[in-house]
């Protein structure tokens, strides 16, 4: 079975690597433009140069191409707490990230928000904070984990999942109340 190729892939596959088929003349293979440049004019004939121009400020191409326009540089999303790690250049898009002691939470494939790493107060760090994952905490006795924070068992209500973790404390409280009534 032959895999289905898109029109552009079909056209490109006829030419050797690093070249593309002339859109008006499929007997001509033109050299692709280097990263940091874009296609201004196709090569006029076999063995002749493709007219490639450098990307203007605020745009880039990160690989060899035959694009008619450079791609616009990404902007870091300040409302998501993002900071610029490295600026856009003609051959590389802007790199956005988070500040120190923060991690990324992805709302979608390409969109992340920065959040502060949990400090595990009243607990210990089980797994350190990573680029895309918050710290994993283990709580001290008398505390339970709620939204990745160690909360006192005195805040544990019977309906919450904490009852198993806080059971000894709850039993102790109940026991002291009972002993006071005798």
């Amino acid at each position: 079975l032959v895999p289905h190729l898109g029109d552009r892939e079909k056209r490109d596959s006829v030419c050797p690597q690093g070249k593309y088929i002339h859109p008006q003349n499929n007997s001509i293979c033109c050299t692709k433009c280097h990263k940091g440049t874009y296609l201004y004019n196709d090569c006029p004939g076999p063995g002749q140069d493709t007219d490639c121009r450098e990307c203007e400020s605020g745009s880039f191409t990160a690989s060899e191409n035959h694009l008619r326009h450079c791609l616009s540089c990404s902007k870091c999303r300040k409302e998501m707490g993002q900071v610029e790690i490295s600026s856009c250049t003609v051959d590389r898009d802007t790199v956005c990230g988070c500040r120190k002691n923060q991690y990324r939470h992805y709302w979608s494939e390409n969109l992340f928000q920065c959040f502060n790493c949990s400090l595990c107060l009243n607990g210990t760090v089980h797994l350190s904070c990573q680029e895309k994952q918050n710290t994993v905490c283990t709580c001290h006795a008398g505390f339970f984990l709620r939204e990745n924070e160690c909360v006192s068992c005195s805040n544990c209500k019977k309906s919450l999942e904490c009852t198993k973790l806080c059971l000894p404390q709850i039993e102790n409280v109940k026991g002291t109340e009972d002993s006071g009534t005798t």
Epitope: W107, S108, N110, E147, N148
Partner: nanobody, 120 residues
Framework: EVQLLESGGGLVQPGGSLRLSCAAS????????MYWVRQAPGKGLEWVSA????????YYADSVKGRFTISRDNSKNTLYLQMNSLRAEDTAVYYC?????????????WGQGTLVTVSS
């Protein structure tokens, strides 16, 4: 079959409050980011708020920050949006959505929406 059913919309005076609910079924609700998106009359979609699977991370658009609160109850497969200090510009159809799109307004599944009208 994935279903998202919004409720709680209605007519409210400026400064008033409403609580929207979204009942989810047909997928593992507790595993997904959930979103509230709105569309004002004659305008495009606006991403209002989002909440992570366990509710630890939340996002709010600048236009609603400090007034709206997103929450979820995974035991009830329900998403909420508490809307306080409502303004005329909050008038819109509010949709809950689920999924991981390639950008902020691309979702796998949508509800049918609930209309919120803020007017005196």
């Amino acid at each position: 079959e994935v279903q998202l059913l919004e409720s709680g919309g209605g007519l409210v005076q400026p400064g008033g409050s409403l609580r929207l609910s979204c009942a989810a079924s047909g997928f593992t609700f507790a595993k997904y980011n959930m979103y509230w998106v709105r569309q004002a009359p004659g305008k495009g979609l606006e991403w209002v708020s989002a909440i992570s699977p366990k509710g630890q991370q939340t996002y709010y658009a600048d236009s609603v920050k400090g007034r709206f609160t997103i929450s979820r109850d995974n035991s009830k497969n329900t998403l909420y949006l508490q809307m306080n200090s409502l303004r005329a510009e909050d008038t819109a159809v509010y949709y809950c959505a689920e999924g991981m799109g390639s950008d902020a307004i691309t979702f796998d599944y949508w509800g049918q929406g609930t209309l919120v009208t803020v007017s005196s």
